[in-house]
Interface confidence: low
């Protein structure tokens, strides 16, 4: 049975398409190609006589068509108007005509799209943002990318308008993007330049640092306040409820016991209209809360190198203290094999190596005083030779 096949079926505007013929009968007088789904003399493109090997253009010939002896038809520099059906009529030597219809689709080369937005400075948890991919074109698939990833499944993301519009419901600070849209048709694809959102948010609850509460008289008090916010927050300080200054940092030199009290940091975002405060108690005292001597324990004090691990634990009954570790007068951890956990109370070494042998101790401290544990000795033995390389099987 006579058939035709378009190569390719989807053609880019300006390119060429070959209407390929299969199962062409042997004994032929000639054949003709017509535009459309049926034989219509007014829409003949070209006729070809086998005997004379001569091609004759028809009324629908545009000068871009070439017919081949195997009946295939080449159309060059195609336009979207060339989209549609094409019918081949074969005149066989027994004067029985046979017909076959094929088709192809011409798509434009797509331009670089752009993204328009109805709100480029949305407020977190309040505003929605609608992105629209321009231009609107026929027979085009619209795709969206966030952070170079296809759209995640999320109830806050909605596609509409044939996927041309992406709506973010109730934006968050993590929705900054970048956003890109891509337009596709069967013959081309193009991606927009990235667009980012300036999400206005905050301020979050401020943090006052350092975390110290106790200070000695004569010391300098330097407090810093930070709250996540966009645009950046404006800060002010109050001491015992009385306004002091509008700065992010508060500095009081040579403090006395009279400087004890509640220190309030106030953070304000003029765009969102939101305010947040944090209160910190400062105690200025001569008294030194005595930090008790901590106890140090080891899961084992003699270990096999390159094989065993060891956990050292620093125990104290004091609260509000910090812990640091020392080995041969150097602070730890000093290698990737050493890990601190549980608020620095535990030092883990995994695996233990020869250079880890020696004396360890821990120190507990607060802003006012500190105390050291007795040292503990870690012995490292090597019972057997290690593997030639450090890689484990698999």
């Amino acid at each position: 049975q006579l058939t035709t096949e378009s190569m390719p079926f989807n053609v880019a505007e300006g390119k060429e398409v070959l209407l390929l013929v299969h199962n062409l009968p042997q004994q032929l007088f000639g054949y003709s190609w017509y535009k459309g789904e049926r034989v219509d003399g007014n829409r003949q493109i070209v006729g070809y006589a086998i005997g004379t090997q001569q091609a004759t253009p028809g009324p629908a010939n545009s000068g871009r068509e070439t017919i081949y002896p195997n009946a295939s038809l080449l159309i060059q520099n195609v336009t979207q108007n060339d989209t549609g059906f094409y019918t081949l009529q074969v005149i066989k030597s027994d004067l029985v005509n046979e017909e076959a219809t094929g088709q192809f689709h011409v798509y434009p080369e797509l331009p670089k799209p752009s993204i328009s937005s109805n709100n480029s400075n949305p407020v977190e948890d309040k505003d929605a943002v609608a992105f629209t991919c321009e231009p609107e074109t026929q027979d085009t698939t619209y795709l969206w990318w966030i952070n170079n990833q296809s759209l995640p499944v999320s109830p806050r993301l909605q596609l509409s308008n044939g996927n041309r519009t992406l709506t973010l419901l109730s934006v968050t600070r993590n929705d900054t993007g970048p956003y890109e849209c891509e337009i596709q048709n069967p013959v081309s694809a193009n991606r927009s330049d990235p667009v980012t959102l300036n999400v206005t948010y905050g301020p979050d609850t401020p943090t006052i640092s350092p975390s110290d509460t106790y200070y000695r008289p004569g010391a300098n008090l330097s407090l810093s306040c930070y709250a996540a916010s966009n645009p950046p927050a404006q800060y002010s300080w109050l001491i015992n409820g009385t306004f002091q200054q509008s700065t992010q940092e508060l500095f009081i030199p040579n403090i006395t016991v009279n400087n004890s009290g509640s220190y309030t940091c106030h953070a304000n975002n003029s765009v969102t209209g939101c305010n947040r405060t944090t209160v910190k108690t400062i105690i200025v005292t001569e008294l030194s809360p005595v930090v008790a001597k901590p106890q140090i324990k080891a899961s084992k004090t003699t270990v096999t190198g390159d094989k065993d691990s060891v956990n050292l634990t620093c125990s104290t009954n004091d609260t509000g203290i910090s812990i640091r570790w020392f080995f041969k007068n150097q602070s730890l951890p000093s290698s990737e094999r050493m890990k601190l956990s549980q608020g620095n109370t535990t030092l883990s070494i995994n695996p233990v190596k020869r250079e880890d042998a020696g004396t360890y101790w821990c120190e507990v401290f607060n802003p006012i005083s500190k105390n050291q544990s007795d040292p503990i000795m870690l012995n490292v033995n090597y019972n057997a030779l290690p593997q030639e390389n450090g890689l484990s099987p698999g």
């Epitope: 026929q138 698939t141 795709l143 759209l151 044939g162 996927n163």
Partner: antibody, heavy 118, light 110 residues
Framework: EVQLLESGGGLVQPGGSLRLSCAAS????????MSWVRQAPGKGLEWVSW?????GKGLEWVSRLTISRDNSKNTLYLQMNSLRAEDTAVYYC??????????????WGQGTLVTVSS | QSVLTQPPSASGTPGQRVTISCSGS????????VSWYQQLPGTAPKLLIY???KRPSGVPDRFSGSKSGTSASLAISGLRSEDEADYYC???????????FGGGTKLTVL
């Protein structure tokens, strides 16, 4: 209730042609991408092709098989030309509810058997 | 040979938990969602899991899906005799620009 009903299968000689249809009901057909999936006797599933959702008539081309749709008739088609013995299979039409963003097939027809044999 | 690799068979006794694996590559499972389908003998496939781990309404919570890297798994807990079927994984393949299925796993309930 979503329903997909395939038709048009049967016995055809090698080199012959066949057009399968899939009539859809119970949902807005033009809003969904549709696919054809086939399964040779005793074998696994094999995706044939898909056609995206609206507007109007869509077309995709894979080798000798043309998939098309007519949204006005709520019907999906598969035109199969130059059929070979290896095209023998049950042909299912299936619906993709994700519009192609995370392709999956939530509803399947009961299938129509195409047998290519002389 | 299928683009996604599944074991041809799996088995378990009633009440047991069985897992079926599906291995692919970065062009399919690694960067696209995985679906799982159940095909009871003589019937059309049925969607069990989509988007790696989501269950359509009506699918019992005995069925669960997961994905790690370029591999996915379907777990069936509290195995029942009616779970005896063929199970297929599927995912979009960006390199092939098409949807690919695993070769299927025949689950036998002993």
């Amino acid at each position: 209730e979503v329903q997909l009903l395939e038709s048009g299968g049967g016995l055809v000689q090698p080199g012959g042609s066949l057009r399968l249809s899939c009539a859809a009901s119970g949902f807005t057909f033009s809003n969904y991408a549709m696919s054809w999936v086939r399964q040779a006797p005793g074998k696994g599933l094999e995706w044939v092709s898909w056609v995206r959702q609206a507007p109007g008539k869509g077309l995709e081309w894979v080798s000798r098989l043309t998939i098309s749709r007519d949204n006005s008739k709520n019907t999906l088609y598969l035109q199969m030309n130059s059929l070979r013995a290896e095209d023998t299979a049950v042909y299912y039409c299936a619906r993709d509810p994700t519009k192609g963003y995370a392709p999956t097939f939530d509803y399947w027809g009961q299938g129509t058997l195409v047998t290519v044999s002389s | 040979q299928s683009v996604l690799t599944q074991p041809p068979s799996a088995s378990g006794t009633p009440g047991q938990r069985v897992t079926i694996s599906c291995s692919g590559s970065s062009s399919n499972i690694g960067n696209n969602y995985v679906s799982w389908y159940q095909q009871l003998p003589g019937t059309a496939p049925k969607l069990l899991i989509y988007a790696d781990s989501k269950r359509p309404s009506g699918v019992p919570d005995r069925f669960s899906g997961s994905k790690s890297g370029t591999s996915a798994s379907l777990a069936i807990s509290g195995l029942r005799s009616e779970d005896e079927a063929d199970y297929y994984c599927g995912a979009w393949d960006a390199s092939l620009n098409g949807y690919v299925f695993g070769g299927g796993t025949k689950l036998t309930v002993l």
